[in-house]
């Protein structure tokens, strides 16, 4: 019997406009209904929630109103989206994966995705 | 920092009941899982129930399932355990833990509260 | 259920000694696992966190390997404040099972 395991992308480039996306996929051990993916920042050994969502299956991921992430799921499959990035949030980004509900509960992060973030030039005044 | 101080312990008879409670400061409350484990004297560490962020969901160790029931007050950053139809093997020190945000490991452990049964 | 072995339940050392410490879960853990110490009177303590990684503030003389079923933490040379209770615990998933213990006594 594997561990649960949790897949996403190395590296994302975000926008010009600040928003970087990525993929979080897992591999099951069991028959969750109950899903909890949470984005984790990890600079240095400190460890930050960046945003959190519980999901039943089958339904839509919702983030908090105030949350700067979006995201939508399909099967084990979640597409998330950070928003409002600026260049000193570039990082590593790590999705964790809680099977919440049936019992057992079963834990899975995945490896990181460093997302880099580049702030626009500002553009030059121009002269009319 | 980081302070997890556990109270309600005390010695009560086979059958009742009994609450304990743990002050949590210094972190974001409900950003995490909070688990109670036991300790038996003399005898090695039991975990006994863990419940998650806000609340809804929860989960126990088969020797108490039934009779203890965790919950928690995040807006009070308290987490409790009621204890019911204690037995004898329920004797331990009780402590109140913080499992980490990323891998779930306890890196903070309350002092403990004794929880003695017998008539 | 995931189930924790320990080995050995105790073991007689003297400082200076390399101690090897080994737990088996009873089914893949991945990383998730956390080794403890414990002095009497005392709450535990965490060591090694998610296999190998060192806790902060721990001597670097303790050291944790192993992924899947098997693990090993490992003193490299046995301090006068090591002698104390070893436990194993995965964080995988529930019932968050610890290993019986390991207790490592003056030779």
């Known amino acids: 019997c594997k561990a649960m395991h949790v897949a996403q992308p190395a590296v994302v480039l975000a926008s010009s406009r600040g928003i970087a996306s990525f993929v979080c996929e897992y591999a099951s051990p069991g028959k969750a209904t109950e899903v909890r993916v949470t984005v984790l920042r990890q600079a240095d050994s400190q460890v930050t929630e960046v945003c959190a969502a519980t999901y039943m299956m089958g339904n839509e991921l919702t983030f908090l109103d105030d949350s700067i992430c979006t995201g939508t799921s399909s099967g084990n499959q979640v597409n998330l989206t950070i928003q409002g990035l600026r260049a000193m949030d570039t990082g590593l980004y790590i999705c964790k994966v809680e099977l919440m509900y049936p019992p057992p509960y079963y834990l899975g992060i995945g490896n990181g995705t460093q997302i880099y973030v580049i702030d626009p030039e500002p553009c030059p005044d121009s002269d009319f | 920092q980081v302070q997890l101080v556990e109270s309600g312990g005390g010695v009560v008879q086979p059958g009742r009941s009994l609450r304990l409670s743990c002050a949590a400061s210094g972190f974001t409350f409900n950003s995490y899982g909070m688990h109670w484990v036991r300790q038996a004297p003399g005898k090695g560490l039991e975990w006994v129930a863990v419940?998650?962020?806000?609340?809804?969901?929860?989960h126990y160790a088969d020797s108490v399932k039934g009779r203890f029931t965790i919950s928690r007050d995040n807006s009070k950053n308290t987490l409790y355990l009621q204890m019911n139809s204690l037995r004898a093997e329920d004797t331990a020190v009780y402590y109140c833990?913080?499992?980490?945000?990323?891998?779930?490991?306890?890196?903070?452990w309350g002092q403990g509260t004794l929880v003695t049964v017998s008539s | 259920d995931i189930q924790m072995t320990q080995s050995p339940s105790s073991l007689s050392a003297s400082v200076g000694d390399r101690v090897t410490i080994t737990c088996r879960a009873s089914?893949?853990?991945?990383?998730?696992l956390n080794w403890y110490q414990q002095k009497p009177g005392k709450a535990p303590k965490l060591l090694i966190y998610a296999a190998s990684s060192l806790q902060s503030g721990v001597p670097s003389r303790f050291s944790g390997s192993g992924s899947g079923t098997d693990f090993t933490l490992t003193i490299s040379s046995l301090q006068p404040e090591d002698f104390a209770a070893y436990y194993c615990?995965?964080?995988?998933?529930?019932?968050?099972?610890f290993g019986p213990g390991t207790k490592v006594d003056i030779k």
């Open positions: 419940i998650w962020y806000d609340g809804n969901n929860k």
């Open positions: 615990q995965q964080s995988y998933s529930t019932p968050f099972a």
């Open positions: 089914q893949s853990i991945s990383s998730f």
């Open positions: 833990v913080r499992g980490d945000i990323l891998t779930g490991y306890y890196g903070y």
